[in-house]
């Protein structure tokens, strides 16, 4: 997906009002520096598609984020503000559906979510070109 | 292990500018953001900014906004943060903190008095 | 910004006494809190984190409660190195923000 026509502050207005406190409540727990930031992004069409990659592809050691409560309202945010978003989502829902697993919270789903605030973090920025 | 090593005192005349460094060592310079908090005689720690030394981005607390500065140079793993026109209110102890994504303070430096008299 | 508001701003006790300071948030953090000891000419020394988390190397008697808007860090048995200033900050949103303080003084 081409997330070039989203609507970037309707995106970052959702972060900021609820996504960012499902993240900090996801992370509970972790040391600051536990993790290093790896994952970088560019721009806000980038970092959104870094965001939809770490979040709801699943991951060796890491199958189980697309359930949680800032996974599912980072896909009602790109649903909405994103033209066309859903319509690619179908068949990736269907499949992952298939192999829905119990949620456990692995070391390696929190340096994930660690690099997805990082993402979010460089998303938000005020100057972050969008092309 | 860990280490963040500031610069001197300084005494400065209002109007004047503050160039206060922060050394840093024991970690991967990239790897975290590094965060300027400030300390009033008997008032409240205040954040001030913070950067991301990968990128050399910064943020800002607004109340600082327009004054401050925090730039990084990377090959002397090093942290700058500049305070322009410093009134006599500037006079304060300036911490260099270390946090990753989470910003919580688990390293600091020893801090550096700032001291803006005429 | 979220406004971090101590009680109480001083606090006179004697060793071995089990003390109790307050933080309120303005608004929700979750449990984004950490609470840090100061003394004189010193930097800052992180206690608690994630409200009730220890840091590395603190000793057992510090202990930390609370989520949402009303956190608490408590000194079951007050021991001579534990007199200095106390401050809670909130990292659930930009900008971070601090308490504060609580002074703790000698009786």
């Known amino acids: 997906y081409d997330f070039t026509n989203c609507d970037f502050e309707k995106i970052k207005a959702a972060y900021l009002s609820t996504i960012s406190k499902d993240l900090i409540t996801y992370m509970s727990g972790t040391k600051s520096t536990e993790f290093n930031n790896t994952v970088s992004c560019s721009n806000r069409p980038h970092c959104l598609t870094e965001i939809q990659s770490l979040t709801f592809n699943p991951t060796a050691g890491c199958a189980s984020l697309a359930k949680e409560m800032f996974a599912m309202k980072t896909k009602a945010a790109l649903a909405i503000w994103c033209p066309g978003y859903s319509e690619t989502q179908i068949n990736a829902t269907q499949a992952m559906k298939k192999r829905r697993k119990r949620k456990v919270t692995t070391n390696k789903c929190l340096e994930q979510v660690s690099q997805l605030q990082g993402l979010w973090r460089r998303f938000n920025r005020p100057l972050l070109k969008q092309q | 292990q860990v280490q963040l090593v500031q610069s001197g005192a300084e005494v400065k005349k209002p109007g004047a500018s503050v160039k206060v460094s922060c050394k840093a060592s024991?970690?991967?310079?990239?790897?975290?953001?590094m965060h300027w908090v400030r300390q009033a005689p008997g008032q409240r720690l205040e954040w001030m900014g913070e950067i991301d030394p990968s990128d050399s981005y910064t943020d800002y607390n607004q109340n600082f906004r327009g004054r401050v500065t925090i730039t990084v140079d990377m090959s002397a793993s090093t942290a700058y943060m500049e305070l322009s026109s410093l009134r006599s209110e500037d006079t304060a102890v300036y911490y260099c903190?270390?946090?990753?994504?989470?910003?919580?303070?688990?390293?600091w430096g020893q801090g550096t008095l700032v001291t803006v008299s005429s | 910004d979220i406004q971090m508001t101590q009680s109480p701003s001083f606090l006179s006790a004697s060793v071995g006494d089990r003390v109790t300071i307050t933080c309120k948030a303005s608004q929700d953090v979750v449990t984004a809190v950490a609470w840090y000891q100061q003394k004189p000419g010193k930097a800052p020394k992180l206690l608690i984190y994630?409200?009730?988390m220890r840091h590395t190397g603190v000793p057992s008697r510090f202990s930390g409660s609370g989520s949402g808007t009303e956190f608490t860090l408590t000194i079951s048995s007050l021991q001579p190195e534990d007199f200095a200033t106390y401050y809670c900050?909130?990292?659930?949103?930009?900008?971070?923000?601090f308490g504060q303080g609580t002074k703790l003084e000698i009786k």
């Open positions: 900050q909130q990292y659930s949103s930009f900008t971070f923000t």
């Open positions: 994630w409200a009730s």
């Open positions: 024991g970690y991967t310079f990239t790897s975290y953001l």
């Open positions: 903190a270390l946090t990753g994504t989470i910003n919580y303070f688990d390293y």
